[in-house]
Amino acid sequence: ELCDDDPPEIPHATFKAMAYKEGTMLNCECKRGFRRIKSGSLYMLCTGNSSHSSWDNQCQCTSSATRNTTKQVTPQPEEQKERKTTEMQSPMQPVDQASLPGHCREPPPWENEATERIYHFVVGQMVYYQCVQGYRALHRGPAESVCKMTHGKTRWTQPQLICTGEMETSQFPGEEKPQASPEGRPESETSC
């Protein structure tokens, strides 16, 4: 079941999926001046069996000006611009991508890929949040949001990470030092 919405955004933070559940789709988007090849896939799909998950289909972009040149999927470091899923200020590795059964790793970039990746997540997907540069978490450690099915509708749990600037913290003198990170957003423990 696909999640109806994108993961929630929260002030002064970015999110990233560390691994993608089977069923996740990634749009084959090309950067300005390029388009998908005529017979090319619309999206990549995370599929797998009990032991191994991988991305089906390949995204291929060609120049909008030329009709017959096709470019193979080749990682090009200079093409790896900022994307929604790679905006973190520092590495976050709360899970080992490879060790999660039923999940795919981050797909490698393809030549002339668009600067922002558009994922279509499935129920059970988890994304992790981190404060942007210049802000710090009131609580240390990762905070996440999970796509859940409740009452027949999908929804993302509200992340519990609070990111605060130095000036904001100074309004609250003499208070306890933050220790741990609350996670997720409450959802009923009983499903409908």
């Epitope: 929260i10 002030p11 009131l138 519990q160 609070i162 306890e176």
Partner: antibody, heavy 116, light 107 residues
Framework: QVQLVQSGAEVKKPGESLKISCKGS????????IVWVRQMPGKGLEWMGI????????RYSPSFQGQVTFSADKSISTAYLQWSSLKASDTAMYYC?????????WGQGTLVTVSS | DIVMTQSPSTLSASVGDRVTITCRAS??????LAWYQQKPGKAPKLLIY???SLESGVPSRFSGSGSGTEFTLTISSLQPDDFATYYC?????????FGGGTKVEIK
């Protein structure tokens, strides 16, 4: 389902102490920020502050700093709001809610009346 | 603190009317704004978050718009159940602040 149940209405005299409660159920209580909100009679909503029941990290609104204390007992999934010396101006409805941003789940409120 | 100013403070309307409530922030809050409905003796109920996202189970006649410092809550066709007080709330800072409220009453 997710529920926050608050303790019953209180009538107190100025100078008395008071502790009201907010019990969470249907979710993992220690993992979520609890927000306290005051509503004085016929007035709007005011954010008092937040507490993380997992480790009792607190943040108070400057208006309420030193006037109230937040605490939590995770063994019974309950957050508390307390006063050591009540004033007539503390007369209000007090709500707990699950935060920290938009407040999706609320307690039913506890009416505190302080009168001599 | 970020100051939230709501207008009007009272609004008289009839069933079927299109109703618009405005909320202004004293500084830019991006889209970090929520709207609540409160009925007498009850806790507030979340209607909209992130300025325009409709909370699950809230009727589609409610909509929110705006960003930066100017926001609106619109009820496209007022229903008898909609007579209540409405509050905006910013969460650009975790030190939350609410607007003063708009009471929607029967004309």
């Amino acid at each position: 389902q997710v529920q926050l149940v608050q303790s019953g209405a209180e009538v107190k005299k100025p100078g008395e102490s008071l502790k009201i409660s907010c019990k969470g159920s249907g979710y993992s209580f220690t993992n979520y920020w609890i927000v306290w909100v005051r509503q004085m009679p016929g007035k709007g909503l005011e954010w008092m502050g937040i507490i993380s029941p997992g480790d009792s990290t607190t943040r108070y609104s400057p208006s309420f700093q030193g006037q109230v204390t937040f605490s939590a007992d995770k063994s019974i999934s309950t957050a508390y709001l307390q006063w050591s010396s009540l004033k007539a101006s503390d007369t209000a409805m007090y709500y707990c809610a699950i935060g920290p941003y938009y407040l999706e789940y609320w307690g039913q409120g506890t009416l505190v009346t302080v009168s001599s | 603190d970020i100051v939230m100013t709501q207008s009007p403070s009272t609004l008289s309307a009839s069933v079927g009317d299109r109703v618009t409530i405005t909320c202004r922030a004293s500084q830019s809050i991006s889209s970090w704004l929520a709207w609540y409905q409160q009925k007498p003796g009850k806790a507030p109920k979340l209607l909209i978050y992130k300025a325009s996202s409709l909370e699950s189970g809230v009727p589609s006649r409610f909509s929110g718009s705006g960003s930066g410092t100017e926001f609106t809550l619109t009820i496209s066709s007022l229903q008898p159940d909609d007579f209540a007080t409405y509050y905006c709330q910013q969460y650009n800072s975790y030190s939350l602040t609410f607007g003063g409220g708009t009471k929607v009453e029967i004309k």
